[in-house]
């Protein structure tokens, strides 16, 4: 795989470096420029001279006016102005607005519900496997294994709170130490960021929208990965999280509090519990090595049960096994004792779809996974459509200005921190960082929120989810209070440390640059988004898991050369962009590597071959449906084929960008090809009425 896509004919020019306005943030960002960017998106991109460290030049045909894909699009209001409407028109418009708001809230509701069902589906499909990951004894000695288990389990159960609660119960039961639990919590933090990345994939239809949405979602991923990359070795070396949290727990005499308020669950639970209800204790029991739990179903059958505590007489091998000497007797042959047994009597069945089907967990999980993804996708499309029709012209300008504009000088720096607080507060309200960041993703996609603003909101979301965990810990029973609170605090301080690393100084906001880079690549090669998801959330963790099981020697033997190669490539890239003259001629570019190692183009050809046939069939079907629909509603402009079909048509026409002049972009070394040729202002003809 290429170190970075399309660096084939890179000829670094040490004399001049060019970059678009929305590019690499300088150390002291020009805030007026950002405001301008929000207001006037049609303006040509200004070229700024930059230090060599910020870009790499690649030869590509340079248009006279370059559209920066990271500029927010201006949503043109094609409707009649309010002042030009008559009374009837105004009333109609008002009710139309109310209708849109109701629809928006309705779709938003089902969007959140589908996220909940998606989590349940993942738990049914991979929950038991996730539980078994925890029963691995090597976690205690291998922090790297703990980390990947945290990632895998959270990805499999689609809920960091589930994996965290398993860790808490294991620590409470002394099956795990707090020290061993910290890497798992770090992994859970990474795993939880997959949800909004999946949500971003749903916006794959529009290139420019997808570029922004995917970058906005993956900024969370990169923040978590980079934080772990720095903080895991620091924690292993110093145990600072363990020490700080231990001091806090020991210095305060906490009294059991109340449960964190379930604000969003109150609204969504009535619906989601009609679809499926899970017995989440089963995963915890598997993690605690309970053999009986392995055969239990995660699908809850009985919702109303009567638990009767009774004493029964049982035989024991010897009097030493008696519950107490006074509760010990003999029948002359065997020793007997009295045991407290909890007899569970099933009273009423749960009221959900799958209660009487008696299907295996995998089948129920697969059904729910497909359905929830369809609903998620459908809701997202509708939310984007409604928002697109509402956020036009003046409304869009006001909203974008409000969200993306900074405080006046000298308080501009405070804006981001306020956004962190807003993110934390919103997450605390919805009780889920996944829900908040997933709701944020389409807003980034349609251009309401900039990535620069979404970043602190996401960081705040990370904090918000830990405050919820702290409140939940305070509500734990006596024996679990200490361990659950310490773990929740570890999670909190880990995120605080991450923010301190990757937010205060604009230069250190690497996750934004990396996310934009990935957004550029994924917009051009949309299959790469799925590839990224599989690699980062499944293959890498599973590989590390497998190597860890093989032992330290194998892990080091494979890991060290891989890390060495990555460092070597990064160093080489850094030298190529900053001071290429110190390098031999051959190493000044990547041409010495075969094309498949330095470009995604050959890989794209392979992927296109596989998907092409399916795409063709899909598009033919799409066109037939569209034409039938248009005939029925007698509206020639009411419907368009999906974006994929347009792209397919473009590809068939054989349009290509000739390589000529140098141009650079915001990501450290991303080519024009990765940038994607579809401009941000790609307008579509559609009816504004819903």
């Amino acid at each position: 795989m290429a170190p970075w896509p399309e660096l084939g004919d890179a000829q670094p020019n040490p004399d001049k470096y060019l970059e678009g306005a929305a590019g690499q943030q300088p150390t002291a960002p020009d805030k007026s420029k950002e405001t301008n960017k929000t207001d006037n998106t049609e303006a040509p991109v200004t070229k700024i001279e930059l230090l060599p460290s910020y870009s790499t030049a690649t030869l590509i045909d340079e248009p006279t006016e370059v559209d920066d894909p990271w500029n927010l699009p201006t949503l043109q209001d094609s409707g009649i102005k309010w002042s030009e409407r008559d009374t009837k028109g105004k009333i109609l418009c008002f009710f139309q607005g109310i209708g849109r708001l109701i629809l928006l809230l309705g779709f938003l509701y089902f969007f959140v519900c589908s996220l909940d069902i998606l989590s349940s589906a993942f738990q049914l499909v991979g929950g038991k496997m996730a539980g078994q990951f925890f029963s691995n004894s090597s976690i205690m000695s291998n922090p790297l294994l703990g980390l990947v288990i945290g990632v895998l389990v959270t990805v499999l159960v689609q809920s960091s709170s589930t994996s965290t609660s398993i860790v808490v119960s294991m620590v409470s039961s002394s099956l795990l130490t707090v020290r061993a639990a910290i890497p798992i919590i770090m992994g859970a933090n990474i795993g939880t960021s997959i949800t909004n990345t999946i949500v971003a994939l749903m916006q794959v239809g529009d290139r420019s929208e997808f570029r922004r949405a995917f970058a906005g979602a993956t900024v969370h991923d990169f923040f978590n990965w980079l934080s772990v990359l720095v903080l895991l070795p620091v924690e292993v070396a110093t145990h600072y999280l363990e020490i700080i949290t231990q001091l806090i727990v020991e210095s305060f005499h906490f009294k059991n509090g109340e449960d964190a308020p379930d604000l969003l669950k109150v609204i969504t639970k009535p619906f989601t519990k009609l679809i499926v209800q899970l017995d989440k204790k089963v995963i915890s029991q598997i993690a605690m090595n309970d053999e009986k739990a392995k055969n239990k179903s995660l699908v809850k059958i009985w919702c109303k049960t009567f638990t009767n505590k009774t004493q029964i007489n049982v035989t024991v091998p010897s009097t030493a096994n008696c519950t107490s000497p006074s509760l010990c007797w003999t029948d002359g042959i065997q020793n007997w004792t009295m045991k407290n047994v909890t007899y569970k009597e099933n009273i009423a069945k749960c009221q959900h779809i799958f209660v009487n089907f008696h299907l295996p967990d995998l089948a129920v999980g697969t059904i729910l996974l497909i359905l929830s993804l369809l609903v998620l996708c459908g809701c997202l499309i509708m939310i984007v459509k409604i928002l697109g029709s509402v956020l036009k012209g003046q409304v869009a300008t006001v909203i974008k200005k409000t969200i993306n504009t900074d405080f006046p000088f000298p308080f501009a720096w405070l804006t981001g921190y306020l956004a962190i607080l807003v993110g934390a507060g919103m997450t605390f309200i919805v009780q889920s960082s996944s829900v908040f960041t997933s709701a944020l993703t389409p807003l980034i996609g349609i251009g309401v929120i900039t990535i620069e603003r979404a970043y602190p909101l996401t960081l705040g979301s990370n904090i918000g989810t830990t405050t919820t965990a702290i409140l939940a810990a305070l509500a734990s029973p006596g024996n679990a209070l200490r361990s659950s609170l310490q773990i929740a605090l570890c999670h909190f301080f880990f995120n605080i440390s991450g923010i301190l690393l990757w937010y205060p100084i604009p230069f250190t906001r690497l996750p934004i640059r990396m996310a934009k880079g990935l957004g550029n690549i994924s917009a051009k090669y949309r299959w790469f988004a799925v590839f990224y998801l599989i690699i980062f959330f499944f293959l890498i963790p599973l590989t590390v898991f497998g190597l860890s099981l093989a032992g330290w020697r194998v892990l080091v033997g494979v890991g060290v050369p891989v890390v060495f190669i990555i460092i070597l490539v990064l160093c080489l890239r850094l030298l190529q962009s900053r001071c290429p003259r110190v390098l031999p001629k051959k190493l000044q570019n990547w041409n010495f590597l075969p094309l498949w190692m330095r470009s995604l183009k050959p890989w794209d050809a392979v992927v296109s071959k596989f998907t092409g046939c399916f795409q063709m069939r899909c598009c033919c079907c799409c066109r037939v449906c569209c034409r039938a629909c248009c005939l029925l509603c007698d509206c020639p402009k009411c419907c368009r084929c999906s974006k994929c079909c347009e792209d397919l048509e473009e590809a068939q026409e054989g349009q290509d960008v000739p390589v000529k002049a140098p141009e650079t972009f915001d990501n450290i070394t991303i080519s024009r090809e990765a940038q994607g040729e579809v401009p941000a202002s790609d307008s579509k003809t559609e009816c504004t009425a819903l």
Partner: antibody, heavy 119, light 107 residues
Framework: QVQLVQSGAEVVKPGASVKMSCKTS????????MHWVKQAPGQGLEWIGA????????AYNQKFKGRATLTADKSTSTAYMELSSLRSEATAVYYC????????????WGQGTSVTVSS | DIQLTQSPSFLSASVGDRVTITCKAS??????VAWYQQKPGKAPKLLIY???TRHSGVPSRFSGSGSGTEFTLTISSLQPEDFATYYC?????????FGQGTKLEIK
Amino acid sequence: QVQLVQSGAEVVKPGASVKMSCKTSGYTFTTNNMHWVKQAPGQGLEWIGAIYPGSGATAYNQKFKGRATLTADKSTSTAYMELSSLRSEATAVYYCARGMYGHGAMDYWGQGTSVTVSS
Amino acid sequence: DIQLTQSPSFLSASVGDRVTITCKASQDVGTAVAWYQQKPGKAPKLLIYWATTRHSGVPSRFSGSGSGTEFTLTISSLQPEDFATYYCQQYSSNPLTFGQGTKLEIK
């Protein structure tokens, strides 16, 4: 109703052996333990041992171990006790008693078998 | 072995009297104690088990109490048929042991 009928009185010589029976009826023989209790003339009660007919498991009072052997025949619902190497101290009335399920109280007793050891 | 000591060994009482027989164990036996009645030439008959539970068919005038090491059998109002020898038995551990007996005679 539950009944335990024991074999008749025995007069034996010292050093000899005696095997007495206890035929049961009115309940499932294999579910309850069968206890054997000795009562010497003018003395109190002394537990010899017990057998669980279902599995043939036995337990003995250390004092009688090696001298008493308890067996059971499920087909005839009969319990047996064999006393060997008899001495004059073995002269007593021997009772079989049904143990209550799950504990050591004895709810039904046989009429007793009188054993006299005399030369 | 657990020793059980009954007191008194002999007891004279009249019909209608309230009689109490005690049984002391050499160690804690919980409530694993039974009481038996034996008439001359007859097999013992179970009266009480689990220290306090009356066996089926046993008149209500018989009651048991106690736990741990001290137990009592009480006959609230003596009847002519109640004159016999009474034994306590522990089944807390093997071997099962009986008290030496309390002989209840007519005054």
